[in-house]
């Protein structure tokens, strides 16, 4: 009898009530492997979850998070709320980054600004809650009389030709 069940393909279950005939999974259920004695109930993507892939007879539904949330955990088992750039999610909700830290994403924690002086550089552009500082040449490079074999090219956005 066990051999009969092992012949049941994915998308079916071995129905003990019907002499171990392979019966198709009922609506809203699936079996992803052969030889199953029951079909599993499909996952429902409700609330802050939305359906990324519908359930089929051979595979479970896959969920995503609605706008304003992002996935956490295996197979998007949880949705965590987004915060604005310049904020981090704390136990009491979204809070602005403290001075000296930044977050340029809608998730994750605020990180300290880069310490330019550790690399012997100076701050070219100050940091904000949303952006890290931009480090420039070292103060020595900027002092009068400092020799430079090739002066630095003006900064330009990638893909733009010089004027």
């Amino acid at each position: 009898l066990q051999d009969l069940c092992s012949n049941c393909p994915a998308g079916t279950f071995c129905d003990n009530n019907r002499s171990q005939i392979c019966s198709p999974c009922p609506p809203n259920s699936f079996s992803s492997a052969g030889g199953q004695r029951t079909c599993d109930i499909c996952r429902q993507c409700k609330g802050v979850f939305k359906t990324r892939k519908e359930c089929s007879s051979t595979s479970n539904a896959e969920c995503d998070c609605i706008s304003g949330y992002h996935c956490l955990g295996a197979e998007c088992s949880m949705c965590e709320q987004d915060c604005k750039q310049g904020q981090e999610l704390t136990k009491k909700g979204c809070k602005d980054c403290c001075f000296g830290t930044f977050n340029d994403q809608k998730r994750g924690i605020c990180r300290p600004w880069t310490n330019c002086s550790l690399d012997g550089k100076s701050v070219l552009v100050n940091g904000t809650k949303e952006r890290d500082v931009v480090c420039g040449p070292s103060p020595a490079d900027l002092s009068p009389g400092a020799s430079s074999a090739t002066p630095p090219a003006p900064a330009r956005e990638p893909g733009h030709s010089p004027q």
């Epitope: 949880m78 965590e80 709320q81």
Partner: antibody, heavy 121, light 112 residues
């Protein structure tokens, strides 16, 4: 799966104190707020307060300040509600309710089965 | 404290018929982040409360689609399109916008 198992019924004398426990499993205890809710017989629900087990931070309903004390033991994933100077109006069912910070920080998703407290001489 | 007023106190409904419960708050439940923390819970006889809806209209996992939540500001509604026997119990609205968080007085749904 998430489970909240509360301690059994309590019969205590007026003026005494009681400590109700809520043992949890199936989720990250330290990083989810645990709430306590009171329900008097045949009446509605009243929020007592909440505790963040990670650092012991608490928020109380002003009505329960001095009456209720919330604590948590991270090593056993257990939250506690202590009620002091008990009178008959404290007789009620007390629920622990997990707050799931993964969606928001403001709603209940799992509840304990409730602990019945009877204050009587 | 924010007072949550539910109406009616009792609702007697025939199975298969619709039902509607109102919940009014004494001040707006719109939080500073643009979200409204209004939930609906059901307490079946002898059981713990169970969340049905959060953020006004988001259905909890496993809650049938016959339940819908709507509203904004201070006026909110829970609707059941076709009442079933398992729906009987006491329905509570709950606000988590303002401390202390508060519940409505409850609406008892009875089956005719």
């Amino acid at each position: 799966q998430v489970q909240l198992q509360q301690s059994g019924p309590e019969l205590v004398k007026p003026g005494a104190s009681v400590k109700i426990s809520c043992k949890t499993s199936g989720y990250a205890f330290s990083t989810s707020w645990m709430n306590w809710v009171k329900q008097r017989p045949g009446q509605g629900l009243e929020w007592i307060g909440r505790i963040y087990p990670g650092d012991g931070d608490t928020d109380y309903n002003g009505r329960f300040k001095g009456k209720a004390t919330l604590t948590a033991d991270k090593s056993s994933s257990t939250a506690y509600l202590q009620l002091s100077s008990l009178t008959s109006v404290d007789s009620a069912v007390y629920f622990c309710a997990r707050l799931d910070g993964y969606y928001e920080v403001f709603y209940f998703d799992y509840w304990g089965q409730g602990t019945t407290l009877t204050v009587s001489s | 404290d924010v007072v949550m007023t539910q109406t009616p106190l009792t609702l007697s409904v025939t199975i298969g018929q619709p039902a509607s419960i109102s919940c009014k708050s004494s001040q707006s439940l719109l939080y500073s982040n643009g979200k409204t923390y209004l939930n609906w819970l059901l307490q079946r006889p002898g059981q713990s409360p169970k969340r049905l809806i959060y953020l006004v209209s988001k259905l909890d996992s496993g809650v049938p689609d016959r339940f819908t939540g709507s509203g904004s500001g201070t006026d909110f509604t829970l609707k059941i399109s076709r009442v079933e026997a398992e729906d009987l119990g006491i329905y509570y609205c709950f606000q988590g916008t303002h401390f202390p968080w508060t519940f409505g007085g409850g609406t008892k749904l009875e089956i005719k």
